[in-house]
């Protein structure tokens, strides 16, 4: 089976690597330009130069191109406490990360926010804090895991997937409303 | 384009209660997670309540944890923040956005909606 190619990928192939087919003229191929830099103009003719100028302030490219234009370069989200790791340069585009001791939760594809690390306070930590995950935490006796934090099975309502794990404290507090004490 | 609508806010005294509610006009809200954002007057804008696109999963800033709550409508394209036991330092705009980066552009937010609380 032959994979199905979009135009410009058809276009491409004919040339050999490093070069693009001039789309005035199939019969040339023109040198791509080098990251960094964005096609200005198609080269005139065979074995002539393609006219490649430098990406300007606040654009790059991070790899061979025919680009008419240059990326704009990403910014950080400081509302999802992002912070810049490097900055971008005409070859590269800005990096953002999180900050010691944070986590990168993804909420789609390309958009992550930055989260504390789970301390585990009334727990121990089963598995550590990294990039792209909490750390996983196991609670002592008588907490339990909501939302990665040991709550106190005081807090376990009846109805809740708690009970299991407070089932002792679950019995005696329904013990003390049965009694009638107050 | 998106288009958010943030509604609810007011002035309300210190320890009062708050709802707002956040329509957004998208097809398939039910896929994206939403999240609060709020400023306050020379301040940058801060993370306050976040929610999965089931509403399965929420987080909160430190600030608002244990007071205040996200929910979500999906029937009705519908983000809501309920806000008890208000202090004075949550006075801001507040603001919701949609948490993907198709559709949650840098330079986009709504027109947001202030709260003011008074002590």
């Known amino acids: 089976l032959v994979p199905h190619l979009g135009d410009r990928e058809k276009r491409d192939s004919v040339c050999p690597q490093g070069k693009y087919i001039h789309p005035q003229n199939n019969s040339i191929c023109c040198t791509k330009c080098h990251k960094g830099t964005y096609l200005y103009n198609d080269c005139p003719g065979p074995g002539q130069d393609t006219d490649c100028r430098e990406c300007e302030s606040g654009s790059f490219t991070a790899s061979e191109n025919h680009l008419r234009h240059c990326l704009s370069c990403s910014k950080c989200r400081k509302e999802m406490g992002q912070v810049e790791i490097s900055s971008c340069t005409v070859d590269r585009d800005t990096v953002c990360g999180c900050r010691k001791n944070q986590y990168r939760h993804y909420w789609s594809e390309n958009l992550f926010q930055c989260f504390n690390c789970s301390l585990c306070l009334n727990g121990t930590v089963h598995l550590s804090c990294q990039e792209k995950q909490n750390t996983v935490c196991t609670c002592h006796a008588g907490f339990f895991l909501r939302e990665n934090e040991c709550v106190s099975c005081s807090n376990c309502k009846k109805s809740l997937e708690c009970t299991k794990l407070c089932l002792p404290q679950i019995e005696n507090v329904k013990g003390t409303e049965d009694s009638g004490t107050t | 384009q998106v288009q958010l609508q943030e509604s609810g806010g007011g002035l309300v005294q210190a320890g009062g209660p708050l709802r707002l509610s956040c329509a957004a006009s998208?097809?398939?809200?039910?896929?994206?997670?939403m999240g609060w954002f709020r400023q306050a007057p020379g301040k940058e804008r801060e993370f306050v309540a976040a929610?999965?696109?089931?509403?399965?999963?929420?987080y909160y800033a430190d600030s608002v944890k244990g007071r205040f709550t996200i929910s979500r409508d999906n029937a009705k394209n519908t983000v809501y923040l309920q806000m008890n036991s208000l202090k004075p330092e949550d006075t801001a705009v507040y603001y919701c956005?949609?948490?993907?980066?198709?559709?949650?552009?840098?330079?986009?937010w709504g027109q947001g909606t202030q709260v003011t609380v008074s002590s």
């Open positions: 929610i999965s696109w089931s509403g399965g999963s929420t």
């Open positions: 998208v097809r398939t809200f039910s896929s994206y997670a």
């Open positions: 956005a949609v948490l993907h980066e198709d559709l949650y552009e840098y330079d986009y």
